[in-house]
Interface confidence: low
């Protein structure tokens, strides 16, 4: 990444697995060195309001109390370092939710996985990939959002009631597409527009529910950068 170049932003859903991609272009003559390549991932947590990210989020142990105002930016720390022989190190004990895919590493994919991602994981990440005589780097900013589906009115419904389902993700830009579906037996059944299903952006309006509408409803929000999030809601309609 050139100095002053914009850091790519990766979005993830709180509570879901997140991939921090890193597949640097490796010169052909160095491909044979991948087996012995090492990688170090570092995290600079976002400074933010007290609730957001006190302490070192990926480090174990108690987090220090947050300052009463937005404090100085937390220090960068090493999340995970994997040596040429696959030896892992980092803040002990290493958290199982921080993972590198061993097979991917041998193909030149040094992505870091957070399983699951937490709010405090937001911030800037840098990866340094060490080959025999050179180092390649990746840099990105992880932003985390919360996904939710709400029903209005909430709670159980009676036959012939109306309901609006709203599918949302806390991200400033609008999704490029919204797909609604029902979870049924063998898989997902798309919800088609009909006199009983009015689709409008991230809203689904059911003007007259029936007991057939009981059960899980889902939406998939897809953004222009390819990020997508799937959200479920269980609707209860009394006969």
């Amino acid at each position: 990444l050139q100095p002053g170049a914009e850091v790519p932003v990766v979005w993830a859903q709180e509570g879901a697995p997140a991939q921090l991609p890193c597949s640097p272009t490796i010169p052909l003559q160095d491909l044979s060195l991948l087996r012995r390549a090492g990688v170090t991932w570092q995290h600079q947590p976002d400074s933010g309001p007290p609730a957001a990210a006190p302490g070192h989020p990926l480090a174990p142990g108690p987090h220090p109390a947050a300052p009463s105002s937005w404090g100085p930016r937390p220090r960068r720390y090493t999340v995970l370092s994997v040596g040429p022989g696959g030896l892992r190190s980092g803040r002990l004990p290493l958290q199982p939710r921080v993972q590198l895919d061993e097979r991917g590493r041998q193909r030149g994919d040094f992505s870091l996985w957070l399983r699951p991602a937490r709010r405090a994981d937001a911030g800037e990440y840098r990866a340094a990939v060490h080959l025999r005589d050179r180092a390649l780097s990746c840099r990105l900013r992880l932003r985390l959002g919360q996904a939710s589906m709400t029903a209005s009115p909430p709670g159980s419904l009676r036959a012939s009631d109306w309901v609006i389902l709203n599918c949302s993700f806390s991200r400033p830009d609008r999704p490029a597409s919204v797909h609604w579906f029902r979870n049924r037996g063998q898989g997902r059944v798309p919800v088609r527009e009909s006199p009983h299903h009015h689709l409008a952006e991230s809203f689904l309006f059911l003007p007259q529910v029936s007991p057939m509408d009981s059960g899980p409803w889902g939406c998939i929000l897809t953004y222009r950068d390819g990020f997508n999030v799937s959200i479920m809601y269980n609707l209860t309609v009394l006969g």
Epitope: R184, V189, E193, S194, P195, L199, A200
Partner: antibody, heavy 122, light 111 residues
């Protein structure tokens, strides 16, 4: 009463395009889907696709995706189907039909137009 | 695509007798506790007309001589008793999965 009035018969040359119309009356045009169905002489029925006029959302049979384009004009309560790159295989009667309501799930076609005959011949 | 196979392709029934038409789907057309299969009647030179929706529900204005039954992959349209006005071709249609497909049709004649 619900009525779907289709445009008159079309005679077209191979490679040409035709645009069929289906004017709806007697109900709220934007509240129901309009389906299009093909029937070749002496043959069965084939579903081409559906348009939902309120939003313009369309659902196509993959087989007809490159052949048919469905549109709707809310102001005149009219649905259209354009057929392009016509060949003799497209010679058929084309019906428009309203999608009914039955609990909102994958509804049947409860009212049909009288059909438009399209003949492709050089 | 879901294939609907109708049998017989044609049948001749005496006035006042029962006519039974079968429609078999290549996979289940059931969902949400219902069977998404409909029956239509088409008379020569006319548009199809909806008879039965969701396997067994009689469309408004259709005589009770028509009835439908079945679930999952096997469905039956019964006309009892058959009248002269019933001479037509009958089609089943599934709408559980796109593309929404029709059976090949069954032509009913009077003996």
């Amino acid at each position: 009463q619900v009525q779907l009035q289709q445009s008159g018969a079309e005679l077209a040359r191979p490679g040409a395009s035709v645009k069929l119309s289906c004017k709806a009356s007697g109900y709220s045009f934007t509240s129901y889907g309009i389906n299009w169905v093909k029937q070749r002489t002496g043959q069965g029925l084939e579903w081409i696709g559906e348009i939902y006029p309120r939003s313009g959302n369309t659902y196509y049979n993959e087989k007809f995706k490159d052949k048919a384009t469905l549109t709707a004009d809310k102001s005149s309560s009219t649905a259209y189907m354009e057929l392009r790159s016509l060949t003799s295989e497209d010679s058929a009667v084309y019906f428009c039909a309203r999608g009914g309501t039955y609990d909102g799930y994958y509804y049947a076609m409860d009212f049909w137009g009288q059909g438009t005959s399209v003949t492709v011949s050089s | 695509d879901i294939v609907l196979t109708q049998s017989p392709a044609s049948l001749a029934v005496s006035l006042g007798q029962r006519a039974t038409i079968s429609c078999r789907a290549s996979e289940s057309v059931d969902n949400f506790g219902s069977s998404f299969l409909h029956w239509y009647q088409q008379k020569p030179g006319q548009a199809p007309k909806l008879l039965i929706y969701r396997a067994s529900n009689l469309e408004s204005g259709i005589p009770a001589r028509f009835s439908g039954s079945g679930s999952r992959t096997d469905f039956t349209l019964t006309i009892n008793p058959v009248e002269t006005d019933d001479v037509a071709t009958y089609y089943c249609q599934q709408v559980n999965k796109d593309p929404r497909t029709f059976g090949g049709g069954t032509k009913l004649e009077i003996k």
